[in-house]
Interface confidence: low
């Protein structure tokens, strides 16, 4: 019965079981809903839209890393589809903490201006070097906790309030 | 079979306010979105703005803000639309519509038949 | 906000007859593009998502192409039934916006 299926499983009324709910493929995430005994008759899977990817089966598109705007880093390989984007290096005026533990934030580059004395990716930075790069100016920004704060909260890629 | 049943028609005062509704049937009220589009004669829709039924969160067409209102009530699975301070260019037919996915708020998958306001002295 | 460009407003054809209704956005909206089809008793349905993704149920006479800004709905052997007012919508940026519709009659 419907309340035996899983989180990813539909009550197929033809044979009485349980079924998986078709998986989506990398780069699309589930269009309606599909699991715990009941699949939408138009379940499908869509592409994910510009700026996010997902590896497929069940999970939501996600949005790439915002390496310049959030790690103050510069972007090593743009996401697609499929794939997050990677952060390289700090961005110029900026420098990584090598000793912090990383959290969910991974490894962030902190501002020269907070740096400890001879820090060697700040040696002959200015004082202005963090004044106006991308992602700084305005409240725009989200981190990537945020971000998925927001997808939970059912705003999606639209949202700009 | 999913079914948005709208409240009846409104005959209301400038001035007034107004508050309609839409009852969900036939999926989970909480797994989407609910949309709210204005269409005045004879014209095209409009995005008022929409609700996550779990979280209670909303987007506003910021046209919008300030004049609706979105709130549900989970336990009967009705969304709401208040309307304030109306005046006639609030004369319309207000649609609700159920989204897809909560992650895609601009899709419109079932409407509701559409209720009639008119603002009129 | 993006603007929606519907035309031609409205359209006469004979049945049978393939119809084709254009919609151009005010800047790149990715094929984030869907069609709802509106009856004359104000039945509002989602006909194509995602520019040429079918919705459930919708006949196959119905098709949907378009990149960047211009997009098209296409109708290829019309039917009675087939009469109503056609909106493009756009969804890659809030707040969505509608085209100014397309109503189709039979000659």
């Known amino acids: 019965e419907y309340s035996n299926c899983g989180e990813n499983e539909y009550y197929n009324q033809t044979t009485g079981l349980c079924q998986e709910c078709p998986p989506c493929g990398p780069g699309e995430e589930p269009y309606l809903s599909c699991g715990y005994g009941t699949k939408d008759e138009d379940y499908g899977c869509v592409p994910c839209p510009a700026e996010k990817f997902s590896k497929g089966g069940y999970q939501i598109c996600r949005r790439h890393k915002d390496c310049e705007g959030f790690f103050r880093a510069t972007v090593l390989t743009p996401g697609d589809m499929e794939n997050d984007a990677e952060c390289g290096p700090c961005l110029p005026g900026y420098y990584m903490l090598e000793n912090r533990p990383r959290n969910i934030y991974g490894m962030v580059c902190y501002s020269c201006l907070l740096a400890p004395p001879n820090t060697k990716e700040c040696v002959g930075a200015t004082s202005g070097a963090s004044a106006n790069f991308p992602g700084t100016s305005g409240s725009s920004t989200l981190s990537p906790f945020q971000h998925a704060h927001k997808e939970l909260s059912g705003q999606g890629h639209l949202a700009t309030a | 079979e999913v079914q948005l049943e709208k409240s009846g028609a409104e005959l209301v005062k400038p001035g007034a306010s107004v508050k309609i509704s839409c009852k969900a049937s036939g999926y989970s009220f909480t797994g989407y979105n609910m949309n709210w589009m204005k269409q005045s004669h004879g014209k095209s829709l409009e995005w008022i703005g929409n609700?996550?039924?779990?979280?209670?969160?909303?987007n506003y067409n910021q046209k919008f803000k300030g004049k609706a209102t979105l709130t549900v009530d989970k336990s009967s699975s009705t969304a709401y639309m208040q309307l304030n301070s109306l005046t006639s260019e609030d004369s319309a037919v207000y649609y609700c519509?159920?989204?897809?996915?909560?992650?895609?708020?601009?899709?419109?998958?079932?409407w509701g038949q559409g209720t009639l306001v008119t603002v009129s002295a | 906000d993006i603007v929606m460009t519907q035309s031609p407003p409205s359209l006469s054809a004979s049945l049978g007859d393939r119809v084709t209704i254009s919609c151009s956005a005010s800047q790149g909206i990715s094929n984030y593009l869907n069609w709802y089809q509106q009856k004359a008793d104000g039945t509002v349905e989602l006909l194509i998502y995602?520019?040429?993704s079918l919705h459930s149920g919708v006949p196959s006479r119905f098709s949907g192409s378009g990149s960047g800004t211009d997009y098209s709905l296409t109708i290829s052997n019309l039917e009675p039934e087939d009469i109503a007012t056609y909106y493009c919508?756009?969804?890659?940026?809030?707040?969505?916006?509608f085209g100014g519709g397309t109503k189709l009659e039979i000659k």
């Open positions: 995602s520019t040429s």
């Open positions: 609700i996550n039924p779990y979280y209670g969160s909303t």
């Open positions: 519509a159920r989204g897809g996915v909560r992650e895609l708020p601009g899709w419109f998958t079932y």
């Open positions: 919508q756009q969804y890659s940026k809030l707040p969505p916006t």
